[in-house]
């Protein structure tokens, strides 16, 4: 039960006090008691419940005609059952007794009022009056947890605006309101109560730039909503009529959880006594609601695809045809960024990551815009963000970044359980160097901090700085599977490729050519690849780098070897010993449900079929997956990327609610 104020009574004159329903009010009967009195009794109106405890240990007894010893160990508390119809209509009489004196009476006139700030603390999508049944001042995780949720209003419901909805002080329309969380103030008081009392709604100064609260005028259009709290206003005096009244507020978050903001926002209503104009207002009662800002959540390859993004660039029509066919098979919407908008930047995966935010009443896709800011810089803001599609970015917007800040270096695993710890939304994966040095690359700290602060997909740092481009999607992917954990981890594997090529040579296919049919590309015989000592050494190094990640992933995702599929792939070390795919990197694939768009490797053709394609199909088709090999050689591969790098996917949010997990 909420804590009320302390009321001191004195026999000299009647005391007038306010008691808020649902609160426990302490009654100080000792400090002003007549000197020679040794005991007391209490009588109260029917609407008042008095509890007397003589402790310790506290033995509680409701009032009757009993007398109690007058000593500091006696605790008297009041609660009220109903709101008052008029000021002071509930009475408490304390009678003091002494051995030689007649009883001395002290009178307390109580006004019972109902003041309650309600939000969806039960996470049902509806605001139900709680009236102190639950403590709204704490926010707890898990299926039995409680606490309200706020969305960052980061979409753009007004198509004529260039800004996010949370960047203005206005409510555009009912669409805009739906992105906000409802909070209701319920009051029931005597008619004249607010002539001597005031309600103030407030937020801590440290949180005022993270939230905006609009007050709605009931029965009027949403455009009548006016801002009452926000970055410029930490508090607001409310004009509340006496009697029974409900006031609606709409709350939007302005910031995502981050290193300097744990994501919790407390809104408080304070009841002030303003009856004495000579004195400052006194706090009579406070009620608070704690909201947690919904985290930005990534979706793994195992989630159903809903929309595919790719770029139109010079001469990639065939690539786009293949992606279009794949999207149609997977029943996905397709969005193509035209040449004039991408400014010859084809790396859609690197520019953005599409996740979502969720409250019980609303789910919103949100694009996380990377700070790489090349030709596609404007695409997430201008073409992705919009009505019911949010936007967030982090990191320096001008310089100070590395290739590891592109979002090909940002992936998420499917849900996993690791040594008994559940990650029902999976774990974020990003690449890093294995140790810091003058020239090592790492994901910008601002990005790392943001990802960690979301709390629900605890990040795992992998080692990717050994690659020229340096992205985790160059050596790993996840595909859905009907058995085991519901997915397989795919890892690029030079060892598997050498094994395959050796088998082919043993069967007399040493003369078969890699890169056959590619104009202007020097073809390589299987036997020459196998006999090239330098290439072997390079791939031995690469294998060690991937194996390091393999063990890390097994440990951090709780995987067994049988959860991993090795995809044959060779690499070559280039300048500064950085690795690049030797032939199109098959693990860098587009996963659309059971439909996979895999870079066509142009491997040695044996008995009319590419042996690399055949091997990959034999590994993936038993899982019910359909492999489509896409020619990306000249448009993507030679520019240091593949199919996954050149595409992006919006996926269906998890059915699991993030607030039901325990981070």
């Amino acid at each position: 039960m909420a804590q009320g104020t302390l009321i001191r009574v004195t026999p000299e004159q009647p005391t007038h006090a306010v008691c808020v329903l649902g609160t426990l009010t302490q009654l100080d009967i000792c400090s002003s008691a007549p000197e020679d009195c040794t005991s007391f009794s209490i009588n109260a109106s029917p609407g008042v419940v008095v509890d007397i405890a003589h402790g310790p240990p506290a033995k509680k007894k409701s009032t009757g005609s009993s007398t109690w010893p007058l000593d500091p160990g006696v605790e008297v508390t009041l609660t009220m059952k109903v709101a008052s119809g008029s000021t002071g209509d509930q009475k408490v009489q304390i009678s003091y007794y002494g051995p030689k004196t007649p009883p001395v009476k002290a009178l307390l006139y109580l006004t019972g009022v109902e003041i309650s700030l309600c939000a969806d603390i039960t996470r049902t999508g509806k605001v139900k009056p709680t009236r102190a049944v639950k403590d709204q001042r704490t926010w707890t995780w898990g299926p039995c947890g409680q606490g309200a949720i706020l969305l960052v209003n980061c979409d753009r419901d007004n198509l004529e605006s260039s800004a996010m909805d949370c960047e203005d002080d206005e409510v555009l329309d009912s669409e805009d309101l739906q992105d906000m969380s409802l909070m209701t103030l319920s009051t029931k008081t005597p008619k004249d109560f607010f002539t001597n009392h005031t309600l103030v709604l407030h937020v801590a100064r440290s949180e005022m730039d993270k939230v905006r609260v609009f007050q709605a005028t009931r029965g009027k259009l949403s455009s009548k909503c006016s801002v009452v709290l926000g970055p410029k206003w930490p508090s607001h005096y409310l004009m509340v009529p006496g009697g029974k009244h409900n006031m609606d507020f709409y709350v939007e978050a302005l910031a995502f959880p981050d290193t300097d903001f744990p994501g919790l926002i407390t809104l408080t209503i304070s009841l002030l006594d303003t009856s004495n104009l000579e004195l400052p207002e006194a706090v009579v009662f406070q009620d608070s609601v704690v909201f947690r800002v919904a985290p930005w959540i990534m979706t793994p390859n195992t989630q159903p695809p809903q929309e595919v993004y790719a770029c139109s660039i010079f001469e990639n029509e065939d690539f786009l045809k293949s992606v279009t066919t794949l999207a149609m098979k997977a029943k996905c919407k397709l969005t193509i960024c035209p040449e004039e908008e991408n400014m010859d930047d084809q790396w859609m995966q690197d520019e953005m990551e599409i996740g979502y935010i969720q409250a019980p009443h609303k789910t919103l896709p949100v694009v996380f815009d990377s700070p790489r800011n090349r030709g596609l810089k404007e695409f997430p803001i201008k073409r992705v963000m919009g009505p019911d599609f949010g936007y967030v970015t982090r990191g320096p917007q001008t310089g100070g970044i590395s290739g590891l800040d592109s979002f090909g270096n940002l992936e998420v695993s499917p849900p996993v359980t690791v040594r008994g710890k559940e990650y029902p939304l999976g774990r974020i994966l990003f690449g890093d160097s294995c140790y810091p040095s003058n020239d090592s690359r790492q994901m910008h700290q601002a990005l790392q901090d943001f990802l960690s602060a979301q709390q629900v997909q605890a990040p795992v740092k992998l080692y990717s700085d050994w690659l020229s481009v340096g992205h985790v999607d160059e050596f790993l992917s996840f595909v859905p599977a009907p058995d085991r954990k519901g997915f397989r981890l795919l890892l690029a594997s030079p060892r598997s490729c050498y094994k395959l090529f050796q088998e082919q040579q043993n069967e007399g296919h040493g003369e078969a050519l890699l890169f056959e049919g590619i104009k202007k590309k020097k073809q390589q015989k299987i036997k020459n690849i196998l006999s090239n000592k330098t290439l072997r050494e390079h791939n031995s190094f690469v294998e060690r780098c991937i194996d390091w990640n393999r063990e890390l992933l097994k440990r951090e995702l709780g995987l067994a070897e049988s959860d991993i599929i090795d995809i044959p792939q060779l690499f070559k070390l280039k300048e500064f010993s950085k690795a690049e795919a030797f032939f199109p990197n098959m693990v860098n694939m587009l996963v659309l449900g059971k439909h996979l768009g895999i870079p066509k490797p142009f491997g040695p053709v044996i008995n009319g079929r590419c042996c690399l394609e055949e091997k990959v199909c034999s590994l993936l088709e038993p899982l019910g997956l359909q492999c489509t090999f896409i020619n990306d050689f000249f448009t993507y591969h030679i520019r240091h990327g593949e199919v996954h790098c050149g595409t992006n996917v919006r996926r269906k949010p998890f059915s699991f609610k993030w607030w039901n997990m325990v981070p």
């Epitope: 040095s437 003058n438 090239n532 330098t534 290439l535 070390l573 300048e575 500064f576 520019r639 240091h640």
Partner: antibody, heavy 128, light 111 residues
């Protein structure tokens, strides 16, 4: 074969900044590794910085790390060297140089470590 | 002081051969085959004449040859000609924190 032209040099006070540009013609610079090399008056060559063709990693000499930033804009066919907190010892002719990354060998032979195309250089003088 | 050591000057008569040495350490010349040589005439930009220890770019006469033994690389110019008079610089990839090192340069005088 690509041709390179440097610009942006000039006289600057110690602590000041300059931005050098290296513009390419005759070929697409996105196919090339690019390095900046400098030569102080009457002295030898000193390697300064490198950026790979994919624009995914950079390297710097100890003497300039933290003060200089190399970047590229493949759409503009240019590479840049942003020089901050300049010192008198940074006075030199700055050369832009490149090596083609379009390698067909089974294993690339390390073209980022040598420079087969050079610009004519631009003089940077740091003096009060 | 340069990281790779070259003689300050060498000389030779037309038609003769000269060799310029470039001494490094195990983490640079000793470890890598990425040693290159540049020719620079006064007031001009350097020109690549040898890369990967011994390879010659197209257009460079075969009078120029490169080799390496241990931590020392060498440039040999046979059949010296007057136009060979120039400064010569060696360069190597290195495992040090500066990944490309140059020698201090050698002035070749054709007598």
């Amino acid at each position: 074969q690509v041709q390179l032209v440097e610009s942006g040099g000039g006289l600057v006070k110690p602590g000041g900044s300059l931005r050098l540009s290296c513009a390419a013609s005759g070929s697409t610079l996105s196919d090339y590794f690019v390095s900046w090399i400098r030569q102080a008056p009457g002295k030898g060559l000193e390697w300064v910085s490198f950026i790979n063709s994919a624009n995914t990693f950079t390297y710097y000499a100890d003497s300039v790390r933290g003060r200089f930033t190399i970047s590229r804009d493949n759409a503009k066919n240019s590479v840049y060297l942003q020089m901050n907190s300049l010192r008198a010892e940074d006075t030199a002719v700055y050369y832009c140089s490149s090596a083609n990354d379009d390698v067909d060998d089974i294993v690339a032979p390390g073209r980022g470590y040598y420079m087969d195309v050079w610009g004519r250089g631009t003089l940077v003088t740091v003096s009060s | 002081q340069s990281a790779l050591t070259q003689p300050r000057s060498v000389s030779g008569s037309p038609g003769q051969s000269v060799t310029i040495s470039c001494t490094g350490t195990r983490p640079d010349v000793g470890r890598y085959n990425q040693v290159s040589w540049y020719q620079q005439h006064p007031g001009k930009a350097p020109k690549l004449i040898i890369y990967n220890v011994y390879e010659r770019p197209s257009g460079v006469p075969d009078r120029f040859s490169g080799s390496k033994s241990g931590n020392t690389a060498s440039l040999t110019i046979s059949g010296l000609q007057a136009e060979d008079e120039a400064d010569y610089y060696c360069s190597s990839h290195s495992r040090s924190s500066t990944p490309v090192l140059f020698g201090g340069g050698t002035k070749l005088t054709v007598l």
